[in-house]
Interface confidence: medium
Amino acid sequence: QRFAQAQQQLPLESLGWDVAELQLNHTGPQQDPRLYWQGGPALGRSFLHGPELDKGQLRIHRDGIYMVHIQVTLAICSSTTASRHHPTTLAVGICSPASRSISLLRLSFHQGCTIASQRLTPLARGDTLCTNLTGTLLPSRNTDETFFGVQWVRP
Amino acid sequence: QRFAQAQQQLPLESLGWDVAELQLNHTGPQQDPRLYWQGGPALGRSFLHGPELDKGQLRIHRDGIYMVHIQVTLAICSSTTASRHHPTTLAVGICSPASRSISLLRLSFHQGCTIASQRLTPLARGDTLCTNLTGTLLPSRNTDETFFGVQWVRP
Amino acid sequence: QRFAQAQQQLPLESLGWDVAELQLNHTGPQQDPRLYWQGGPALGRSFLHGPELDKGQLRIHRDGIYMVHIQVTLAICSSTTASRHHPTTLAVGICSPASRSISLLRLSFHQGCTIASQRLTPLARGDTLCTNLTGTLLPSRNTDETFFGVQWVRP
């Protein structure tokens, strides 16, 4: 099945170049495992073109399939620390609306101090993505060590 | 060549499909932590469509937001080797022009022998990306274990 | 500001939006190191738009450069398990047609329980990608821990 009849064409703009790359702002209070993100040219190399931040969490503005990627590096960490504080786990998921809540991507640190991964997933307008870091170790806020982003790929 | 004949269409070139995937050529002399890359169909599955190599470093030809990705595997490595030679760190950054010098992505090997990550970042025409491997261990030159690439994502 | 004037338009289909994200179905019989994948909205968040599954392996339908990504998490795994069962290795490659057989991406688990990576590679219509997990440990079937996907990037 064709996406569209040949004569039905899309302006390039409407292709939905939604994209965001965020840097860590801070961790949550003690009982809140979420990481809080920030983005914008004034902050350096982070940006939001389409998606928005809602209290430090990323909200999607356009339906489609997205490439979601993340890297989190633990601060004050060695392989010994990481294994001693195991399990330290990072999960990226849709946290609202509640009806669509699901874990999209999950990694444990084991004896490492950095996790990095990416995946394709369908997201809908209004989906809010949360990144939960469980465990007692803190993430590094260096912008080249901890970052989170999404890229719209197709309708 | 255009995707389609009609006059109401964008030439492929104007979409900015700049993309490159490189394989390791060699490491630098003793005081130079940079990895030197190579690419081109004659070498296998590496290629450069837009970006260019300048003395083994990747130079960007089109402004935009890029997905930068890398995987580096250490040669003759076990988790014991990796931890004994710690810290071994890989950093990808803009190394020239000097006014734009910045680290974009950084990972340590800890007890692992491979790092892999990716991130979105704005790059400008003329930016040269360097990949610095610090430590005493050498990278594998196997093309399925060590590679570095960029993909233009949007203006 | 629009990326292009309204009259300069591309048929969506001609952009080659081939994309797939798969979840693990099962492992092969004892002498078969391949992972067998499944995808489709009925299964959750996995999908195939363009590529197809052929006996659990991913077959490409459109020539081009693709971003290939994978994450595999070992089940019932700790860093001790992972190192005791070393080497456990994951390789993604073209397994058919035989004339194009090649390893595209390879990672070992060492003391970790998850590997994740991605790379750009040219693929041709009819290429079948296989993911080989060698070693005695089993992969997790959780859809947020083990997944495999491709995204068409350019011709």
Partner: antibody, heavy 122, light 110 residues
């Protein structure tokens, strides 16, 4: 070897301004958060301000908020502190300090300069 | 008034052991305060010794160790040497994004 060298201190009248500089060498400056920490004569240490590695995010101690501005120029491997509306209680040795990058909100200073003395007096 | 408290001065004999403490004016110190210890000799810049309660910074001799003792952070020096004579500052994370330093402990090796 990591080196941090402060300059720009001196005697200034209350209400005046001063700009401190810190020249960094021996490490990849653009990777690290940087800080200013001060020490009044015969007293303890007080954290003043920090700036992230790209220069876009800054934080200040309440005692200097609105009066001091931290900035950096990664191309020159330099950190700055613009001090306006200076008060007698700002008299101190000002140290440039590198954040080890260990934590998302716990500055840990693994390298320090020798300091530059700022005296605010009429 | 200082939020972070330290003994103003302590004395130790060469080869002896001494423990410096770091407390909160109100409340207990835990590892969540990420206690950090710095050493400063006269006319010199401070030097990082211990971070994250008990992790020694690179190059710091193993006679320096950190811990939580009761409701305070502690820096213990075993086998004190003459060149350990210095002022020691502790720093605690109390509120994002700053740290609070203690008033310092002047250690004399006598």
């Amino acid at each position: 070897e990591v080196q941090l060298v402060e300059s720009g201190g001196g005697l200034v009248q209350p209400g005046g301004s001063l700009r401190l500089s810190c020249a960094a060498s021996g490490f990849t400056f653009s990777v690290y958060y940087m800080n200013w920490v001060r020490q009044a004569p015969g007293k303890g240490l007080e954290w003043v301000s920090d700036i992230n590695n790209e220069g876009g995010t800054t934080y200040y101690a309440d005692s200097v908020k609105g009066r001091f501005t931290i900035s950096r120029d990664n191309s020159k491997n330099s950190l700055y502190l613009q001090m306006n509306s200076l008060r007698a209680e700002d008299t101190a040795v000002y140290y440039c300090a590198r954040d080890a990058g260990y934590s998302n909100h716990v500055p840990i200073f693994d390298s320090w300069g020798q300091g530059t003395l700022v005296t605010v007096s009429s | 008034q200082a939020v972070v408290t330290q003994e103003p001065s302590l004395t130790v004999s060469p080869g002896g052991t001494v423990t410096l403490t770091c407390g909160l004016k109100s409340g207990s110190v835990t590892s969540d305060n990420f206690p950090t210890w710095y050493q400063q000799t006269p006319g010199q810049a401070p030097r990082l010794l211990i971070y994250n309660t008990n992790t020694r910074h690179s190059g710091v001799p193993d006679r320096f160790s950190g811990s939580i003792l009761g409701n305070k952070a502690a820096l213990t020096i075993t086998g004190a040497q003459a060149d350990d004579e210095a002022e020691y500052f502790c720093a605690l994370f109390i509120s994002n994004p700053s740290v609070e330093f203690g008033g310092g402990t002047q250690l004399t090796v006598l």
